[in-house]
């Protein structure tokens, strides 16, 4: 037994750490495998992770940790049995990848304006509460070229648009994905989509 | 500078109590990590506890484990060591230590505070 691709972990910098990795033939991750981690530091104690499947040879884990801080750094070792199959170290705030946001909703009665609002997914005591911006993303449902990006740069979780710079009379989705700069994160996955029916008062034509 | 100054040793009875302080100056009040290590007479140093620096979880060798607790106030860039339920075995100089950025709590070192117990 054999590792094909080495473990690649990244952080959501709060609680879980998610390790992937390839394996040189079908493999019973949950059964055949444990992945033992350990903070560098003075009298912390291992943990096992139990894999569990993902794809014939690939395995995923998902490592509970202490509040993540910068300087956190940790030891892995991949064992099958009495045999060590890889050793490796990650630090957390070098592989983030922030929790997507949550709640997203589309407010429609303000005037011809659309107010979209989401949820940051960090506490904030969480260092990256106070460093997201976000990509909110619209697309009609009706017509796949209708799609659009709109980045989020400030930290407010909401976007304003107006009404009109959608086709009025037809359902629309949003989602919205975060990202930090500051620890150059990879994007979070997307929130869940949000749907509403995009309609506006035409302004009278004057003749 | 970085600076740690123990305080709160002394003599105490077995099953008696005793809280160590430990106050850090210098540089920058942030500690990524902070320890107590002691030194029994004739023997070599031991790690006792050692504290993370936001949530403050607490990691503890097995000899004291249920009986010493470690804490920290960060607002007052302070130490403690709290020793219930005190054995002749516990009698040593303890040490407070502290590392900024790595796991091993021993970049910075204070001069210690003996503590005997003795009845």
């Known amino acids: 037994m054999k590792v094909l691709q080495e473990p690649t972990c990244v952080s959501d910098y709060m609680s879980i750490s998610t390790c992937e990795w390839k394996m040189n033939g079908p493999t019973n991750c949950s059964t055949e495998l444990r992945l033992l981690y350990q903070l560098v530091f003075l009298l912390s104690e291992a943990h096992t992770c139990i894999p569990e499947n993902n794809g014939g040879a690939g395995c995923v884990c998902h490592l509970l940790m202490d509040d993540v801080v910068s300087a956190d750094n940790y030891t892995l070792d991949l064992w099958a049995g009495q045999q060590l199959l890889w050793k490796g170290s990650f630090k957390p705030s070098e592989h983030v990848k922030p929790r997507a946001p949550g709640n997203l909703t589309v407010h429609t009665n303000v005037s011809d304006t659309l107010l979209l609002t989401w949820s940051n997914p960090y506490p904030p005591d969480n260092y990256l509460y106070n460093h997201l911006t976000y990509a909110v993303n619209i697309w009609s449902e009706n017509d796949p070229a209708d799609f659009r990006i709109y980045n989020v740069t400030y930290l407010e979780p909401s976007l304003r648009i107006a009404a009109s710079t959608l086709k009025s009379g037809i359902s629309y989705r949003a989602r919205v994905r975060a990202w930090a700069q500051c620890y150059n994160t990879t994007w979070s996955e997307w929130s869940p989509s949000t749907k509403w029916h995009n309609s506006y008062r035409e302004p009278f034509e004057q003749h | 500078e970085v600076q740690l100054v123990e305080s709160g040793g002394g003599l105490v009875q077995p099953g008696g109590s005793l809280r160590l302080s430990c106050a850090a100056s210098?540089?920058?009040?942030?500690?990524?990590?902070m320890a107590w290590f002691r030194q029994a007479p004739g023997k070599g140093l031991e790690a006792v506890a050692s504290?993370?620096?936001?949530?403050?979880?607490?990691y503890y060798a097995d000899s004291v484990k249920g009986r010493f607790t470690i804490s920290r106030d960060n607002s007052k860039n302070t130490l403690y060591l709290q020793m219930n339920s005190l054995r002749a075995e516990d009698t040593a100089v303890y040490y407070c230590?502290?590392?900024?950025?790595?796991?091993?709590?021993?970049?910075?070192w204070g001069k210690g505070t003996l503590v005997t117990v003795s009845s």
């Open positions: 230590a502290a590392s900024d950025n790595d796991g091993n709590c021993q970049d910075y």
């Open positions: 210098g540089s920058t009040s942030y500690r990524y990590c």
């Open positions: 504290i993370r620096p936001r949530s403050g979880r607490a």
